[in-house]
């Protein structure tokens, strides 16, 4: 991690992917410490601010412009050497986002997957991007990069993620770059949450007043478990979104969430999952499916009494 013999290690916090106008801290780690260091940009563009300047512990760059994108290296202070400086560090690529229209990001077969499965994340755009980049929120490593395939006026790339483990769950975004500006990326795609299920014991799902109800009757689905889940997620077969609620401890030592569905119109098959606050994208096994039947004259689909989560937002904490 820390580079070789006389080589410092240059890293970026929080990430090498920086939005236009944002800030990033560059750290040059040399000889088991953060010493004084000098910075260089390989293409020498834009950075008069570096020339002859010595930085202490970290360099805060920003607000960044497209011209900040590129490859950086540092040299650590080495007072007793001939030059006074170490060998150059590893190259660090800083990518600046927000320079072109955002691409779209889709998951095949879908964003809800079992542990061990593989998912294809497809990034596509009608902008002729040469490369696509896939980045997971909260990690400082460089994003994955693929060459875009152009077909019928659309450029796209398929990123294969798997076999899925808890560490791969999270919020993904993709970006595109055009030829000649490889590190000036597009605006981010809408976030896509990849959720891994099957890691903990399944909760139980029940309906009040029961699974068979009269049209117009109020129905509540209760998800509960002996496991101390923080959040429960309720999904309905055929619907893209899920609802979530905070789990409440009950006197019988179970943890429960009650989802009010409102007046019954259409039935459906429901499942619920539990998750912990620390790993919001890692869910339990699915509860046994619960078929809710509505007798009488169904009109339209069931109303949503609460604002449903869309394909994104699942991996954010529920405050």
């Amino acid at each position: 991690l820390m580079g070789g013999q006389d080589k410092p290690f240059l890293s970026a916090r929080p990430s090498t992917v920086v939005p236009r106008g944002g800030h990033v801290a560059l750290q040059c780690h040399y000889r088991r410490g953060f010493n004084n260091f000098m910075l260089y940009k390989e293409d020498r563009s834009h950075v008069p601010i570096f020339h002859g300047r010595i930085f202490q512990e970290s360099f805060i760059m920003g607000p960044v412009t497209p011209a900040h994108a590129g490859t950086y290296r540092c040299r650590g202070s080495r007072p007793h050497s001939l030059t006074g400086w170490s060998a150059p560090s590893n190259p660090l690529v800083i990518m600046v986002t927000g320079n072109h229209r955002k691409p779209s990001l889709l998951a095949h077969p879908g964003p809800l997957l079992k542990s061990g499965e593989t998912v294809i994340l497809q990034c596509w755009s009608d902008v002729m991007f040469e490369h696509f980049f896939l980045h997971r929120e909260g990690i400082s490593e460089d994003p994955s990069r693929l060459v875009g395939q152009i077909h019928d006026g659309v450029s796209k790339a398929n990123f294969s993620i798997g076999p899925l483990m808890p560490v791969l769950a999270g919020t993904y975004r993709c970006y595109g770059s055009v030829p000649h500006s490889p590190y000036q990326l597009s605006a981010p795609s809408d976030p896509l949450d990849i959720v891994i299920t099957g890691l903990y014991e399944k909760p139980s799902l029940s309906a009040q007043p029961g699974p068979t109800v009269q049209a117009g009757e109020n129905v509540t689905l209760s998800c509960s478990s002996w496991s101390s889940y923080d959040i429960y997620h309720l999904s309905r077969e055929g619907e893209a979104h899920e609802r979530r609620l905070r789990a409440v401890p009950k006197v019988n030592r179970t943890f429960q969430a009650d989802f009010p569905l409102g007046p019954a119109t259409h039935g459906g098959t429901y499942r619920c999952f539990g998750s912990f606050r620390a790993l919001p994208c890692v869910w339990s096994n699915s509860s046994d499916p619960l078929l809710v039947s509505v007798t009488g004259n169904p009109s339209s689909s069931w109303p949503s009494p609460t604002e449903p989560s869309s394909k994104s937002g699942i991996c954010r904490h529920l405050h």
Epitope: H23, V24, Q27, I49, R53, Q56, F59, I60, G62
Partner: antibody
Framework: QVQLVQSGSELKKPGASVKVSCKAS????????MQWVQKSPGQGLEWMGW????????KYAEDFKGRFVFSLDTSVSTAYLQISSLKAEDTAVYFC???????????WGQGTTVTVSS | DIVMTQSPSFLSASVGDRVTITCKAS??????VAWYQQKPGQPPKLLIY???TRHTGVPDRFSGSGSGTDYTLTISSVQAEDVAVYYC?????????FGGGTKVEIK
């Protein structure tokens, strides 16, 4: 959205100390620094120095070395300016502003008026 | 220290006029110049940095240009809400230094 909220006005006697706070929100506090700028009555803007919120290392302009101290409490995303042995000429509005090694100050606090008078 | 000499110190313009404020650095500052707007009773607001990069949310009637020691802020069609003091600042080398300010008034 990025916001910097400074503590209220202060009236102090010569020789006293004052501590001005600047609470940041809307961004990751440790990825940027905090610059401090003084605006004395009838004068322009004068850069006092800054503190790197990632490393905690402060840097002071020549005229502000000695009685002026920058500090941080990253747990509450707050930067502080402490001035000791106050003099009448320290009477000014003090601004905090987000910025890093490149010296661009992209968001500013509302300013804190410090009046030094006997 | 780098001295930033700003001119004029005061200007009066009519709504719709093109307004130009200049700043001269005492040495080459390699395009590391920012411009700020300070309205009465408010803190300064960043308009432009690296000579010509507009900050988020800044109207496109504000533009910056220049190189070497000479830099310009232009308001292509001044509006009533642009009444303020405008400051240039070099961010080439510490200590960062500001110009003396230009007060813009609407006739």
């Amino acid at each position: 959205q990025v916001q910097l909220v400074q503590s209220g006005s202060e009236l102090k006697k010569p020789g006293a100390s004052v501590k001005v706070s600047c609470k940041a929100s809307g961004y990751t506090f440790t990825t940027a620094g905090m610059q401090w700028v003084q605006k004395s009555p009838g004068q322009g803007l004068e850069w006092m120095g800054w503190i790197n919120s990632h490393s905690g290392v402060p840097k002071y302009a020549e005229d502000f070395k000695g009685r002026f101290v920058f500090s941080l409490d990253t747990s509450v995303s707050t930067a502080y300016l402490q001035i000791s042995s106050l003099k009448a000429e320290d009477t000014a509005v003090y601004f905090c502003a987000r910025g890093g090694d490149e010296g661009v100050m992209d968001y500013w606090g509302q300013g804190t008026t410090v009046t030094v008078s006997s | 220290d780098i001295v930033m000499t700003q001119s004029p110190s005061f200007l009066s313009a009519s709504v719709g006029d093109r307004v130009t404020i200049t700043c001269k650095a005492s040495q080459d500052v390699s395009t590391a110049v920012a411009w700020y707007q300070q309205k009465p009773g408010q803190p300064p607001k960043l308009l432009i940095y690296w000579t010509s990069t507009r900050h988020t949310g800044v109207p496109d009637r504000f533009s910056g240009s220049g190189s070497g020691t000479d830099y310009t802020l232009t308001i292509s069609s001044v509006q009533a809400e642009d009444v303020a003091v405008y400051y240039c600042q070099q961010h080439y080398s510490t200590p960062w230094t500001f110009g003396g300010g230009t007060k813009v008034e609407i006739k």
